[in-house]
């Protein structure tokens, strides 16, 4: 699986999950998030050669098409597969609120 | 929606579905598919600016991150959203077989 366990331990050029730390205030301008200051959102990148973690029949077909037609601009793209939520603390006036934001952390990638 | 109705009628630079005809024999080397000879598989391409058909909270965050950090390599990617099946005819020996291959035709795209 193209997950953090594999990708963070290997120098993988092809599609894999990459570490990306996002600081809410500095990187997003989100001053309203009090906790955490930031988090590892991670991201997916790298080429998608034929059959590499193909998401659908279409991505398999497109991968083969791209292999046999290297000049073609059409190829699968490395995108998030499994995502996890992130719990944040913010304030509404003086009232603290805790919310779980869904699909915030990329745990694995796929070629789609 | 970034679907064929919209994308095929507009000169859209950003993430959209693009027409792509694939000939089974010539483009994939699949001699075993007898009907159809080929089909419009289509594909997704184009930049994913902030908030453009964002698939998840992560793609929204990543889009904003990329807007505020233009030098960053991390950005959402334009990938298939809705796909449709394709019915094919092939032969096993002298016996004709008809099969519906799932997720073969891209009908719309998203930023993921």
């Amino acid at each position: 699986a193209l997950d953090t366990n594999y990708c963070f331990r290997n120098l993988e050029e092809n599609c894999c999950v990459r570490p990306l730390y996002i600081d809410f205030r500095q990187d997003l301008g989100w001053k309203w998030v009090h906790e955490p200051k930031g988090y590892y959102a991670n991201f997916c990148s790298g080429p998608c050669p034929y059959l590499r973690s193909a998401d659908t029949t279409h991505s398999t077909v497109l991968g083969l098409y791209n292999t046999l037609n290297p000049e073609a601009s059409a190829s699968p793209c490395c995108v998030p597969q499994d995502l996890e939520p992130l719990t944040i603390l913010y304030y509404v006036g003086r009232t603290p609120k805790v919310e779980q934001l869904s699909n915030m952390v990329v745990k694995s990638c796929k070629c789609s | 929606a970034l679907d064929t109705n919209y994308c095929f009628r507009n000169l859209e630079e950003n993430c959209c579905v693009r027409p792509l005809y694939i000939d089974f024999r010539q483009d994939l080397g699949w001699k075993w598919v007898h009907e159809p000879k080929g089909y419009y598989a289509n594909f997704c391409s184009g930049p994913c600016p902030y908030l453009r058909s964002a698939d998840t909270t992560h793609s929204t965050v990543l889009g904003l991150y990329n807007t505020l950090n233009p030098e960053a390599s991390a950005s959402p990617c334009c990938v298939p959203q809705d796909l449709e099946p394709l019915t094919i005819l092939y032969y096993v020996g002298r016996t004709p077989k008809v099969e519906q291959l799932s997720n073969m035709v891209v009908k719309s795209c998203k930023c993921s």
Epitope: - | K31, H34, E35, T87, L89, Y91, V92, G93, R94, T95, P96, V98
Partner: antibody, heavy 119, light 111 residues
Framework: EVQLLESGGGLVQPGGSLRLSCAAS????????MSWVRQAPGKGLELVAD??????????YYSDSVKDRFTISRDDSKSTVYLQMNSLRAEDTAVYYC??????????WGQGTLVTVSS | DIQLTQSPSSLSASVGDRVTITCRAS??????????MHWYQHKPGKQPKLLIY???NLASGVPSRFSGSGSGTDFTLTISSLQPEDFATYYC?????????FGGGTKVEIK
């Protein structure tokens, strides 16, 4: 260009034997089924024998009229298909065509070889 | 086995005529939207030639005056404007199941 060249036809007495050969070129012989189709004088086309590719275990078919007397075989290394005809009868007199069916249709045909069974 | 019955067994026509030949199968030779019927032209002393595959697809190099239609059990070969070189015997053939079989043929003669 696809070419199918039959040979081995001729005059033979009833009860005798003949072996027809069909040398193929211009296509991926190993991938496709091969057939023998005949036309007897004043009659229509009849599929006599058929052999599919190695992928499908060289499965064979014979028409009822030739079953247990004719044997179809192929040598993929020589791109050749054969029809061994034993216990020949007068009603086997016909032009025998070698043909290839990549799908459900017989796309290419040889020029035919005449088999005459007569005493 | 699936039997194919062609009609007429022979016909006389003139150059320029529109000619229609039918082929009826003893059971359906269609599967899903695919119609597994094919048509051939056979001239004396020559090998048969594929004209139409899968009911309506023109084989390579075949003039557009030839067309095919039909589904299920009933199929038609049409020559829109008969030419001198079209006088021949025409056969249908199915590939719905093994064994594949041919129709009895339709001989097109000069009137």
């Amino acid at each position: 260009e696809v070419q199918l060249l039959e040979s081995g036809g001729g005059l033979v007495q009833p009860g005798g034997s003949l072996r027809l050969s069909c040398a193929a070129s211009g296509f991926d012989f190993n991938s496709y089924g091969m057939s023998w189709v005949r036309q007897a004088p004043g009659k229509g086309l009849e599929l006599v024998a058929d052999i599919v590719s190695k992928t499908y275990n060289y499965t064979t078919y014979y028409s009822d009229s030739v079953k247990d007397r004719f044997t179809i075989s192929r040598d993929d290394s020589k791109s050749t298909v054969y029809l061994q005809m034993n216990s020949l009868r007068a009603e086997d007199t016909a032009v025998y065509y070698c043909t290839v069916a990549p799908g459900g249709s017989f796309d290419y045909w040889g020029q035919g070889t005449l088999v005459t069974v007569s005493s | 086995d699936i039997q194919l019955t062609q009609s007429p067994s022979s016909l006389s026509a003139s150059v320029g005529d529109r000619v229609t030949i039918t082929c009826r199968a003893s059971q359906s030779v269609s599967i899903s939207r695919f119609n597994l019927m094919h048509w051939y032209q056979h001239k004396p002393g020559k090998q048969p030639k594929l004209l139409i595959y899968r009911a309506s697809n023109l084989a390579s190099g075949v003039p557009s005056r030839f067309s095919g239609s039909g589904s299920g059990t009933d199929f038609t070969l049409t020559i829109s404007s008969l030419q001198p070189e079209d006088f021949a015997t025409y056969y249908c053939q199915h590939s719905r199941e093994s064994p594949w079989t041919f129709g009895g043929g339709t001989k097109v003669e000069i009137k």
